[in-house]
């Protein structure tokens, strides 16, 4: 969370940004809020990126002005126009690329004053893992798969019954490059699993952490997955 202040004569407004992460090949959002102003035509929003000449995006007089937009962002950005009057200057970014990572500035000018704040935008790939019982194996085993990660994550297994146990000797993890030659598919197999136990497969890089849980009993298999972005908010 970054809060910036601006001064315009005696007036300043608070601009707030949130460090966030973008999943490459998907939509991303650069979050920025400011003190609302009911006069839409008096609001100017400028998004800038460190090291880039020209603007990422500009919104003024109630509409987009892309006359100074840098080519790498052409056709890839939009503000949430209907939410500008309530203080939302967040930017929607299409088809996030690795090269979109960096420091962005959200600059706001309204009839109340002006202000700006920076945000760090990280880019990579992250996805939910899915755990299944691998019946093909010679002994009962679990297979944890997640389709897209970048940079290469670490993978660790844990179990409810054997808390603190190191499963690296009884697991095998592989990383397979996906067709776009950037992200990788993560596959980890845990061998010699026991029934009536809950196992967790944890995948983590510097952008996100994902966990898949599986509980195997005689009568059923229960699964749960969650994903959290690191260092955001």
């Amino acid at each position: 969370l970054i809060i910036g202040f601006g001064i315009s004569g005696k007036h300043f407004i608070t601009v707030t940004t949130f460090t966030s992460a973008g999943n490459i090949g998907e939509d991303g959002t650069l979050s920025c809020t400011f003190e609302p102003d009911i006069k839409l035509n008096g609001i100017v929003i400028q998004w800038l990126k460190e090291g880039i000449k020209g603007l990422v995006h500009e919104f003024k007089e109630g509409k987009d002005d892309l006359s100074q937009q840098h080519e790498m962002f052409r056709g890839r950005t939009a503000v949430f126009a209907d939410q500008v009057v309530v203080g939302n200057a967040s930017l929607r970014l299409k088809n996030v690329q690795l090269t979109d990572a960096g420091t962005y500035t959200c600059y706001i000018r309204t009839s109340k004053g002006k202000g700006n704040a920076n945000l760090e935008y990280k880019t990579g790939a992250f996805s939910m893992p899915e755990i299944n019982v691998d019946y093909n194996a010679s002994s009962e085993s679990l297979r944890c798969e997640a389709p897209r990660w970048f940079p290469q994550p670490t993978v660790a297994w844990a179990s409810q019954v054997d808390q603190g146990a190191n499963f690296s000797e009884v697991s095998n993890t592989s990383f397979e490059l996906n067709s776009e030659n950037v992200t990788m598919k993560v596959v980890s197999v845990l061998y010699n699993v026991t029934i009536n136990n809950t196992y967790s497969c944890m995948i983590e890089n510097d952008i996100a952490k994902a966990t898949g849980d599986i509980k195997v009993t005689d009568s059923e298999v229960k699964r749960r997955s969650q994903l959290q972005l690191l260092n955001s908010g």
Partner: antibody, heavy 121, light 107 residues
């Protein structure tokens, strides 16, 4: 309501040029990309290119580069497709379509009624 | 440029059938795949965008899914008004590309 109204059918000779218009209403013309798509008789859809009326920025299918020009007139909220050096294979229905997402180039969500261009000697 | 290979080119089905149409991108990954329905003499109609988001007003029997290079349009229970030609569109890159189309005919 978003509406795109295209100009009428055209018959052209090989080697000539054609200019098709697409008049937009029901939204802020300068805030959304407009694309052009064609469909030859009995064939599939083929993307030609698009334009951002707010700045005049264009993208073109490599297949048509050098033969196609997409322009706009913001005063009349009209987009134009001009295709030169026409040949018989250019006989098709030409559609204009608004791209969803305003300055973000989205999918084509609203379409014109189409303009039949016939190229025949 | 990314090409979209759509299959099958045509299929015959009955009312109530579950129908699946697929599109395979020649390269890369992005979720920017849309699906259109077109009836003879009419302009295409947007059904689904961003892989799986249903366009407002489109019946819920239409659904989209996919990831990586493979994308699918599913009609869960075919209705008489669904007999038409369907196209996928890749719109994530600078250059857009349609699939070749799938004609859904009455068996």
């Amino acid at each position: 309501e978003v509406q795109l109204v295209q100009s009428g059918a055209e018959v052209k000779k090989p080697g000539a040029s054609v200019k098709v218009s697409c008049k937009a209403s029901g939204y802020t013309f300068t805030s959304y990309w407009i694309g052009w798509v064609r469909q030859a008789p009995g064939q599939g859809l083929e993307w030609i290119g698009d334009i951002y009326p707010g700045g005049g920025y264009t993208n073109y299918n490599e297949k048509f580069k050098g033969r196609v020009t997409i322009t706009r007139d913001t005063s009349t909220s009209t987009a134009y497709l001009e295709l030169s050096s026409l040949r018989s294979e250019d006989t098709a229905v030409y559609y204009c379509a608004r791209l969803d997402g305003s300055s973000y180039r989205g999918a084509m969500d609203s379409w014109g009624q189409g303009t039949l261009v016939t190229v025949s000697s | 440029d990314i090409q979209m290979t759509q299959s099958p080119s045509s299929l015959s089905a009955s009312v109530g059938d579950r129908v699946t149409i697929t599109c395979k991108a020649s390269q890369g990954f992005n979720k920017y795949v849309a699906w259109y329905q077109q009836k003879p003499g009419k302009a295409p109609k947007l059904l689904i965008y961003y892989t799986s988001t249903l366009q407002p007003g489109v019946p819920s029997r239409f659904s989209g899914s996919g990831s990586g290079r493979d994308y699918t349009l599913t009609i869960s229970s075919l209705q008489p008004e669904d007999f038409a030609t369907y196209y996928c569109l890749q719109y994530g890159n600078l250059l857009y590309a349609f699939g070749q189309g799938t004609k859904v005919e009455i068996k």
